[in-house]
Interface confidence: medium
């Protein structure tokens, strides 16, 4: 089961779509590449600057709120899903 961590204060950084292992998987940073992009789909910050934001979870971009948040793996919580519950 997965929990969406409610962020009231923003987290912040680069996070790619999913980190599912127990150990944080860090993607290469540096933003998006690909020059001459025309008619691009709307950019998802989770694929660029917030690529590594969610330590044990999945980055979610809520476009109408212009917000990036984390959907934590089971047993993890916190803005960046970096804290493990003791249960």
């Amino acid at each position: 089961s997965v929990r969406v961590e409610q962020v009231v204060k923003p987290p912040q950084n680069k996070t790619e779509s999913e980190n599912t292992s127990d150990k944080p998987k860090r993607k290469k940073k540096g933003g998006k590449n690909g020059k001459n992009r025309r008619n691009r789909k709307k950019k998802n910050p989770c694929n660029a600057e917030f690529q590594n934001f969610c330590i044990h979870g999945e980055c979610k971009y809520i476009e109408h709120l212009e917000a990036v948040t984390c959907k934590c793996q089971q047993e993890y919580f916190g803005e960046r899903c970096g804290e493990k519950s003791m249960k």
Partner: antibody, heavy 119, light 107 residues
Framework: EVQLVQSGAEVKKPGASVKISCKVS????????MYWVRQAPGKGLEWIGY????????GYSQKFKGKATLTVDKSTSTAYMELSSLRSEDTAVYYC????????????WGQGTLVTVSS | DIQMTQSPSSLSASVGDRVTITCKAS??????LSWFQQKPGKAPKTLIY???RLVDGVPSRFSGSGSGQDYTLTISSLQPEDFATYYC?????????FGGGTKVEIK
């Protein structure tokens, strides 16, 4: 209250290095990227790069690769920028800025650190 | 890198005037654009993000519009405290890039 407090003005000789700091308080340091921007006297703003304080991962504008090194000390909630091989063109005010994320925009800035490079 | 061309570089206006500043990106930036105000000796302050969203606490006389490559900051009725330099910033793609700035001076 969120605060970003930068170190004081520096005067350096050409070829020297300088390390300026940005100490934060009032929020969880590792939850927000720290950005660095510079402004030469009478000129516009220039984006240098950013660092993720949790991992210590930096990202740089191509222009500043090899010139700026961004680091953090999580224990003191401080971000650092070291500038190497200083030249007169590096004379500028350097700002740190926090990027909020809910929504994500630059919501807090340091007061700026003036670095003067002069022989 | 994405180039941001801001115009005019300076303008003179009077209190009560409507002021418009434009920024043109060298490619589509998907409305990932902020506007900043900077006063002498001070750090920049964000006014607008995502092209048209007003930061909390910023007076409603400031507004942003635009999409694709072309963006505008409008001050509907200039106030004495609005005399400053304004910058746009694209944050669609690394490295983020600023426009050259527009200095708004008293006529």
């Amino acid at each position: 209250e969120v605060q970003l407090v930068q170190s004081g003005a520096e005067v350096k000789k050409p070829g020297a290095s300088v390390k300026i700091s940005c100490k934060v308080s009032g929020y969880a340091f590792t939850n927000y990227n720290m950005y660095w921007v510079r402004q030469a006297p009478g000129k516009g703003l220039e984006w240098i790069g950013y660092i993720d304080p949790y991992y210590g991962d930096p990202g740089y504008s191509q222009k500043f690769k090899g010139k700026a090194t961004l680091t953090v000390d999580k224990s003191t909630s401080t971000a650092y920028m070291e500038l190497s091989s200083l030249r007169s063109e590096d004379t500028a005010v350097y700002y740190c800025a926090r990027r909020g994320n809910f929504p994500y925009y630059f919501d807090y800035w340091g007061q700026g650190t003036l670095v003067t490079v002069s022989s | 890198d994405i180039q941001m061309t801001q115009s005019p570089s300076s303008l003179s206006a009077s209190v009560g005037d409507r002021v418009t500043i434009t920024c043109k990106a060298s490619q589509d930036i998907n409305s990932y654009l902020s506007w900043f105000q900077q006063k002498p000796g001070k750090a920049p302050k964000t006014l607008i993000y995502r092209a048209n969203r007003l930061v909390d606490g910023v007076p409603s006389r400031f507004s942003g519009s635009g999409s694709g490559q072309d963006y505008t900051l409008t001050i509907s009725s200039l106030q004495p405290e609005d005399f400053a330099t304004y910058y746009c910033l694209q944050y669609d793609e690394f490295p983020y890039t600023f426009g050259g700035g527009t200095k708004v001076e008293i006529k």
